[in-house]
């Protein structure tokens, strides 16, 4: 018979044939042949693979760093990572948690629409037109932008959301 | 190496007042946004002021309005609060934080206990 050149679901193709995935939660030990099944072992203590595979070794489970704020949310299996979170009234800096911060800051061209509380990091707006921020804060709101109007000047350089307007003085028109 | 150092904490009566400072270290202080933060006995935490890298702009929580005053030397790279009309539930481990806010830049904190 014509060797495969494809196999089923669950299965990967090694030496003209088509061998069974070691399944989540262990890693293969040696490869099927024409006698015998893939063998696959048990992940260790500490490893884990999350899928069907055909790896040699299993990953490390994360370490949730206390030195970094973190701490274990959920521990890991043979079948999954272990899920790291921050110490109470701190924040994720990414969807994997892998370090914390206070709260976060806006940066220039938003403004904060709430402070950080324990629950919830800050939540930054983007600087309408008229209003800007030129920092980095975790506190400050878009300031409004100066009105040259009031102070008797014209604008010589319009504003941004990260830029206030640059006022100067009117052109006198001589007699 | 970034440090920062709390100290001013102690015992005072309510009605009194205390001055905070943090000393920081090992990057240049001026232009840096600077927060004071303070831990109850079995609470969370609660972020109390604020002072932006220039100092024109500052934010205090409401139950610290009108008591509290925040204040930065750049010249001696230290951060203050000064507290006055202190309450018992002022009560805490107060810190100060730096951006961007890590958790290693923590500092140790002092204690200040409001009690009669």
């Known amino acids: 018979p014509e060797p495969p050149t494809a196999c089923r679901e669950k299965q990967y193709l090694i030496n003209s044939q088509c061998c069974s995935l070691c399944q989540p939660g262990q890693k293969l030990v040696s490869d099927c042949t024409e006698f015998t099944e893939t063998e696959c072992l048990p992940c260790g203590e500490s490893e884990f693979l999350d899928t069907w595979n055909r790896e040699t070794h299993c990953h490390q489970h994360k370490y949730c760093d206390p030195n970094l704020g973190l701490r274990v949310q959920q521990k890991g299996t043979s079948e999954t990572d272990t899920i790291c979170t921050c110490e109470e009234g701190w924040h994720c800096t990414s969807e994997a948690c892998e370090s914390c911060v206070l709260h976060r800051s806006c940066s220039p061209g938003f403004g904060v629409k709430q402070i950080a509380t324990g629950v919830s990091d800050t939540i930054c707006e983007p600087c309408p037109v008229g209003f800007f921020s030129n920092v980095s804060s975790a506190f400050e709101k878009c300031h409004p932008w100066t009105s040259c109007e009031t102070k008797d000047l014209v604008v010589q350089q319009a504003g941004t959301n990260k830029t206030d307007v640059v006022c100067g003085p009117q052109d006198r028109l001589r007699a | 190496e970034v440090q920062l150092l709390e100290s001013g904490g102690g015992l005072v009566q309510p009605g009194g007042s205390l001055r905070l400072s943090c000393a920081a270290s090992g990057f240049t202080f001026a232009g840096y946004e600077m927060w004071w933060v303070r831990q109850a006995p079995g609470k969370g935490l609660e972020r109390v002021s604020?002072?932006?890298?220039?100092?024109?702009?500052?934010y205090y929580a409401d139950s610290v309005k009108g008591r509290f005053t925040i204040s930065r030397d750049d010249s001696k790279n230290t951060l203050y609060l000064q507290m006055n009309s202190l309450r018992a539930e002022d009560t805490a481990v107060y810190y100060c934080?730096?951006?961007?806010?890590?958790?290693?830049?923590w500092g140790q904190g002092t204690l200040v206990t409001v009690s009669s």
């Open positions: 604020a002072i932006s890298g220039s100092g024109g702009s500052t």
């Open positions: 934080a730096k951006e961007p806010y890590s958790f290693d830049y």
